[in-house]
Interface confidence: low
Amino acid sequence: FNISGCSTKKLLWTYSTRSEEEFVLFCDLPEPQKSHFCHRNRLSPKQVPEHLPFMGSNDLSDVQWYQQPSNGDPLEDIRKSYPHIIQDKCTLHFLTPGVNNSGSYICRPKMIKSPYDVACCVKMILEVKPQTNASCEYSASHKQDLLLGSTGSISCPSLSCQSDAQSPAVTWYKNGKLLSVERSNRIVVDEVYDYHQGTYVCDYTQSDTVSSWTVRAVVQVRTIVGDTKLKPDILDPVEDTLEVELGKPLTISCKARFGFERVFNPVIKWYIKDSDLEWEVSVPEAKSIKSTLKDEIIERNIILEKVTQRDLRRKFVCFVQNSIGNTTQSVQLKEKRG
């Protein structure tokens, strides 16, 4: 189809080479009140057809996306040629950053409902470039966490180094829907609920003497509980002695509760104390046996093929640790009598 009648929008994606990030394009087809754009010719009120294109329907989910090859070849259907680009309703998701994403993307309705729809399309010229070292070193991340129940904020990564006063007007979207009230480079959330989780997009306009571009960034927001202030506690073993039968196999379980931490590096291990010697035991991998929003219970077992006299003289120590501190619980084996 002829794309000369498509409206044009220029977008800039400056990606950080330090982190994974995604990008989206919205198919910003004209709203019903702007529907003259969708006509091949301007119509006088008497000529307006019974069904104006898009009139009365805000559901523009049934759209087709194409990429325009730079060499002038025919338009390519995005779904067939680009596995790292995914279409969902009227949004195009770029899953991996890279300058090779630069180019012209065209969207139009999949169903042409009348001859007046022909020119109803949008051409988006996307320029993708890596962030230069000169850019702000401490720009906001493309993955941001909000603490449930507290006050929080979502920062636009491409503007996070600017003060609110300097910042241009920002357009925010959440999960593809326009957040019409938000215009600053930061969304302040008075009280965080789990529904604040989602994909946020922030746009602002950057102009030079020649043209103007929409600078866009995508932020994945996750709602979490606060980092624990406690070291892990050992739930099992509780007793420091354990009655055993000599010559029989034995499994001692160590279960520990670790509070939530954003950066979670739990340690749970067994070691043996034998008079002056102390060594870590190679035991089966630890496994998570219960996970909630607030904490996680991790278990690790020590397995003795058969209990010997020597084991009765040893201490079996479970050691657990998180970023706050560590806890230990030792177990002494005692021969069962009778």
Epitope: D194, G198, T199, T223, K290, S291, L293
Partner: antibody, heavy 117, light 110 residues
Framework: SVEESGGRLVTPGTPLTLTCTVS????????MSWVRQAPGKGLEWIGI?????DTYYTSWAKGRFSISKTSTTVDLKVASPTTEDTATYFC???????????????WGPGTLVTVSS | DVVMTQTPASASAAVGGAVTIKCRAS??????LAWYQQKPGQPPKLLIY???SLASGVPSRFKGSGSGTEFTLTISDLECDDAATYYC????????????FGGGTAVVVK
């Protein structure tokens, strides 16, 4: 959206991988689960992979099934299918909902696996 | 693993009437229970979560109640479109209990 693929007729013991392809949301935020339904029978939970790639399985599925993911797909590997594994396999997004619970909010249409010699 | 037992296996009522489906958990799962509706050839659809909270877009004719081990789904003012199989699911987040479904209840609307 969520869509399963890979369902086919296999002979017992032939390893099988089902793939769930998602679009419109990020697997780094949501938990995804696999559920199956034998012809004319009820729903059976297999397991779940969280946003952080932790996996949890129902007891009968441990060792027989394994769930893994990439940025846009969630795989279910059936190590050694038996005729009892004949079923429609569903992939579902399990959202964290108000009240601290999880539930299957977005489901794929399912993919049929037939295990027969 | 927790076991979810649903009763009855099937139920029928006239249009405008009501049906009650019960679900029992083999151990205390607090309010961590969801209800789904499934029609032939379709995936399940979430109706209720947290035992009594209505999922988005679900009519208020569907009502969930209960906690601990006993749960109930009541469908009032039955419509023909309510003919389906209904499942309860334990959503307690624990490696040994998460996910178990009830056996299902087929609802026939006369």
């Amino acid at each position: 959206s969520v869509e399963e693929s890979g369902g086919r007729l296999v002979t017992p013991g032939t390893p099988l991988t089902l793939t769930c392809t998602v679009s419109g949301f990020s697997l780094s935020v949501y938990a995804m689960s696999w559920v199956r339904q034998a012809p004319g029978k009820g729903l059976e939970w297999i397991g779940i992979i969280t946003w952080s790639a932790d996996t949890y399985y129902t007891s009968w599925a441990k060792g027989r099934f394994s769930i893994s993911k990439t940025s846009t797909t969630v795989d279910l590997k059936v190590a050694s299918p038996t005729t009892e594994d004949t079923a429609t396999y569903f992939c579902a997004r399990f959202d964290y909902l108000v009240g601290g619970t999880w539930a299957g909010v977005l489901w794929g249409p399912g993919t049929l696996v037939t295990v027969s010699s | 693993d927790v076991v979810m037992t649903q009763t009855p296996a099937s139920a029928s009522a006239a249009v405008g009437g009501a049906v009650t489906i019960k679900c029992r958990a083999s151990e205390d799962i607090e309010s961590y229970l969801a209800w789904y509706q499934q029609k032939p050839g379709q995936p399940p659809k979430l109706l209720i979560y947290s035992a009594s909270s209505l999922a988005s877009g679900v009519p208020s004719r569907f009502k969930g109640s209960g906690s601990g081990t006993e749960f109930t789904l009541t469908i009032s003012d039955l419509e023909c479109d309510d003919a389906a199989t209904y499942y309860c699911q334990c959503t307690y987040w624990d490696s040994s209990t998460v996910g178990a479904f009830g056996g299902g209840t087929a609802v026939v609307v006369k």
